[in-house]
Amino acid sequence: MAVTACQGLGFVVSLIGIAGIIAATCMDQWSTQDLYNNPVTAVFNYQGLWRSCVRESSGFTECRGYFTLLGLPAMLQAVRALMIVGIVLGAIGLLVSIFALKCIRIGSMEDSAKANMTLTSGIMFIVSGLCAIAGVSVFANMLVTNFWMSTANMYTGMGGMVQTVQTRYTFGAALFVGWVAGGLTLIGGVMMCIACRGLAPEETNYKAVSYHASGHSVAYKPGGFKASTGFGSNTKNKKIYDGGARTEDEVQSYPSKHDYV
């Protein structure tokens, strides 16, 4: 029961996390205009991974896409790549984890197979979460660097009457969404990996005892057989499930509402 709960919770947490990573990647507010020096701006600038936007006092918002690949900073390209890799891995992980869920039965899939799938999806979620966290962190670092550089050059042409104020950018909402979402995906992945340990059948060595009618000696054969790990083979073998021994037949003879054949 605890394993199912851990697996289910891991799946849900990862699902929320990946949805958050997708949302963060699509959001326009990765960086927003710093209003510290000019809190009464009539023009508010913000930028995303794919386009930059300007919102005027009226609410009129104008967004312009980055219609170039070669002209973009390498760091921005790297962030895009990390986020996309995170989404792709997360999506594959979700697909795998759906089939790995203990509450869903697909044909005669054994728990060992589900354990492997759970582990695979868990690792995918962990890597996905790390990609998102890395991507957001790289962008944040880029912002911090640019912020202090533009602060140093805040006013150009101070010698004359004319001032050119450089727009400074600070952390946007998407960064926080990305960090939280990446963290959730990572946590979900860890939970899936933990659930995998509980799902995997114990490598129990049953000792075969041979009794001889005439002799007094008892022969012990170590390692009689291992619990079945194949698909559909040795279905009559006894396995340990959460402390209770049941046969595969017993497990399959009571289909629940969650079973899909």
């Epitope: 009464v40 600038n45 005027e56 006092s57 009226s58 609410g59 009129f60 104008e62 450089q166």
Partner: antibody, heavy 119, light 113 residues
Framework: EVQLLESGGGLVQPGGSLRLSCAAS????????MHWVRQAPGKGLEWVAY????????YSTDTVKGRFTISRDNSKNTLYLQMNSLRAEDTAVYYC????????????WGQGTLVTVSS | DIVMTQSPDSLAVSLGERATINCKSS????????????LTWYQQKPGQPPKLLIY???TRESGVPDRFSGSGSGTDFTLTISSLQAEDVAVYYC?????????FGGGTKLEIK
């Protein structure tokens, strides 16, 4: 047709108060930010205050801060300017203007109401 | 606050001739985010409220005759009337629309020579 009609102007003594109103019609009032702009007799235009469409944001020029308050009642399609501690230099024609959807401009203006501050 | 300086204070131009009004801001009005200049031009005829002519430094408001055009970027802007008509006699104001408080230029009085 967009119409803005100011009212509430008149003669007031220094230190006195006055409340200007601007009745809007011909457009969805709650969709637009609104401005007050004044013009002293024979002088140029001076922007006074702005209120966003949702009433959440207000800005005003330093010379009137703490004395003038801009507000709006979207249910009545009316813009207000509460003027306290009036000074002689506040004497002007006060215009209400609609904030344009583009370029932070002011696309429609009322005919104005004259406020005279004199003892 | 941004200071707007208009020149000349007054201008006399013959009918059909070109009229040019200049406006200079103390701070750049060019927004890097959309590469637009937040400068507006208004026309005020005697006894009337101002009328919007041009926003974003060069975009004509609907209904404004095409003889009116705006140009410039950053801190230097120009309003041009390509062929002056009698009805163009007015005071013209430039206005910063980049940050609050909005500020107007002193105005340029345009008359017929």
């Amino acid at each position: 047709e967009v119409q803005l009609l100011e009212s509430g102007g008149g003669l007031v003594q220094p230190g006195g108060s006055l409340r200007l109103s601007c009745a809007a019609s011909g457009f969805t009032f709650s969709d637009y930010g609104m401005h007050w702009v004044r013009q002293a007799p024979g002088k140029g235009l001076e922007w006074v205050a702005y209120i966003s469409r949702g009433r959440s944001t207000t800005y005003s020029t330093d010379t009137v801060k703490g004395r003038f308050t801009i507000s709006r009642d979207n249910s009545k399609n009316t813009l207000y300017l509460q003027m306290n501690s009036l000074r002689a230099e506040d004497t002007a024609v006060y215009y209400c203007a609609r904030g344009s959807y583009y370029g932070n401009a002011m696309d429609y203006w009322g005919q104005g109401t004259l406020v005279t501050v004199s003892s | 606050d941004i200071v707007m300086t208009q020149s000349p204070d007054s201008l006399a131009v013959s009918l059909g001739e070109r009229a040019t009004i200049n406006c200079k801001s103390s701070q750049s009005l060019l927004n890097s985010g959309n590469q637009r200049n937040y400068l507006t031009w208004y026309q005020q005829k005697p006894g009337q409220p101002p009328k919007l002519l041009i926003y974003w430094a060069s975009t004509r408001e609907s209904g404004v005759p095409d003889r009116f055009s705006g140009s410039g970027s950053g801190t230097d802007f120009t309003l041009t009337i390509s062929s002056l008509q009698a009805e163009d006699v007015a005071v013209y104001y430039c206005q910063s629309a980049y940050s609050y408080p909005f500020t107007f230029g002193g105005g340029t009085k345009l008359e017929i020579k």
